[in-house]
């Protein structure tokens, strides 16, 4: 949900043209703010969990990465909101929660994200393959809804919290060695203009190698950041399929907000407010990235509820954890 | 070899609804990107959105002229996308194509999805 920006590519000045130096490195710091600033339009993240413990328990968890303010988040299941799916939960920042069943528990987990924990026995219960849909309202960005349903991998029976054995995943790898090139490209810019400022009139003399700058190394998070990010399990629960259709929940404008002492709207304001949940990480390794994605023209995967840089029993795709980051 | 087939397309009248649909078949891999483009009459193809698998969270991206309209959703396991579009305008009519990627990096730019479906035809009459 953002508008492109084409970034021009980085090229090493060329040693002849002393006078294009000065515009050229100009164009640098312009590049970079194109790179941060493009990093813009919302995102939605929705992510379902089945609990090992619990088969017939999920959790939903749901997130909006946007600048705006959310005014109205709706959960539905059995697809989108406007398309068959059933309301199972809807959120307001300052007239509360309703939920209906098989919702058990609704409520914030940040400003701009919110957990659903569902149970259920018998016919309103969700099933593994049941589509959980999110819409956030926002100002100014508008509505956005995202869906998501259990990955093909999570085994109900086999799905463990994942090992914290550090491990960089693939495209990690790739976009901090990329990012490497490119602060390398940048130090180097800067030695050369430098070079140029403090160059004494030209004389002939023997032209030297100048000495190469040191290439910028990208580091991971600490371990022990790595198990702040990490996201503890919560819980939904199956037996199988939405509620039918006639037994629907309204889907029209919240009315009964007026009557709603069912749960005082709570969002924390601080990082204190809630332990167990991951807070946005924002950082100049988080930075570099959205940056390199800014550039490619996408915005960066990793924008989800928590940094899992871990190995998982569950295979490549459960290894590519989310991020919680802007 | 992988293709990806559209269905859903046809005509409807501005403001209405039409659910758009694409699954893999042959011999797939899981996809970790599934998106959709679309190309009006004498325009270029354009990105509508795109679903983005990873671990147990789905990231979900749109285009700006998306506003709320349209939702994407699919199902990883199935290797199936769906764009669920209301509202519709005579503006969307345009040919809607279906992207697929094996490999976990996101993209809406075209030549970043390994396969492609043939199109399906969308027609929004005033």
């Known amino acids: 949900m953002r508008t492109e920006a084409q970034v021009p590519a980085l090229q090493p000045p060329e040693p002849g043209l002393e006078g294009a130096m000065g515009h050229r490195t100009l164009v640098l710091p312009w590049v970079l703010l194109t790179l941060c600033v493009t990093a813009g339009t919302p995102e939605v993240w929705v992510q379902v969990r089945m609990e090992a413990t619990e088969l017939s328990s999920f959790t939903i968890r749901c997130g909006f990465l946007g600048s705006g303010s959310i005014s109205l988040v709706t959960v539905s299941w059995g697809g989108p909101n406007g398309a068959g799916g059933t309301t199972l939960a809807v959120l307001h920042p300052e007239r509360g929660i309703r939920q209906w069943a098989p919702a058990r528990q609704a409520r914030w987990e940040t400003q701009s994200s919110i957990s659903l924990i569902l149970e259920g026995s018998g016919a309103s219960s969700p099933c593994a393959n049941t589509t959980f849909c999110c819409k956030f309202a926002s100002f100014p960005e508008g509505s956005w809804e995202a869906c998501g349903s259990l990955p093909p991998s999570s085994d109900p029976g086999l799905s463990a919290p994942p090992t914290p054995a550090p491990i960089l995943r693939a495209d990690l790898a790739g976009i901090l060695g990329v990012s490497g090139v490119l602060l390398f490209g940048c130090v180097y810019l800067l030695h050369l203009l430098r070079r140029h400022k403090h160059r004494p009139a030209p004389r002939l003399q023997p032209s030297r190698t100048s000495p190469q700058a040191p290439r910028a190394r990208a580091w991971a998070p600490s371990q022990a950041s790595q198990a702040a990010l990490h996201v503890p399990y919560a819980t939904i629960n199956t037996s199988c399929r939405p509620a039918t259709l006639d037994t629907a929940h309204p889907h029209g404008g919240p009315s009964w907000w007026a009557s709603l002492p069912t749960h005082a709207a709570h969002r924390p304001q601080g990082p204190a407010a809630w332990a167990s949940t991951p807070i946005p990480a924002r950082g100049s390794f988080v930075s570099v990235e959205n940056g390199l994605y800014a550039q490619a023209g996408e915005r960066p995967p990793h924008t989800g509820p928590g940094l899992t840089l871990f190995p998982d029993p569950r295979g490549p795709r459960a290894m590519e954890g989310p991020l919680g980051v802007r | 070899q992988v293709q990806l087939v559209e269905s859903g397309g046809g005509l409807v009248q501005s403001g209405g609804s039409l659910r758009l649909s694409c699954a893999a078949s042959?011999?797939?891999?899981?996809?970790?990107?599934m998106g959709w483009f679309r190309q009006a009459p004498g325009k270029e193809r354009e990105f509508v959105g795109r679903?983005?698998?990873?671990?147990?969270?789905?990231?979900?991206s749109y285009a700006d002229f998306v506003k709320g309209r349209f939702t994407l959703y699919g199902n990883q396991a199935r290797n199936t996308v769906y764009l669920q579009m209301n509202s519709l305008k005579v503006e969307d009519t345009a040919v809607y194509y279906c992207?697929?990627?094996?490999?976990?990096?996101?993209?809406?730019?075209?030549?970043?999805?390994?396969?492609w479906g043939q199109g399906t035809q969308v027609t929004v009459s005033s």
């Open positions: 992207a697929g990627r094996v490999v976990p990096l996101p993209s809406r730019q075209r030549d970043r999805y390994d396969y």
């Open positions: 042959g011999r797939t891999r899981s996809m970790y990107v």
């Open positions: 679903i983005k698998w990873s671990g147990d969270t789905t990231y979900t």
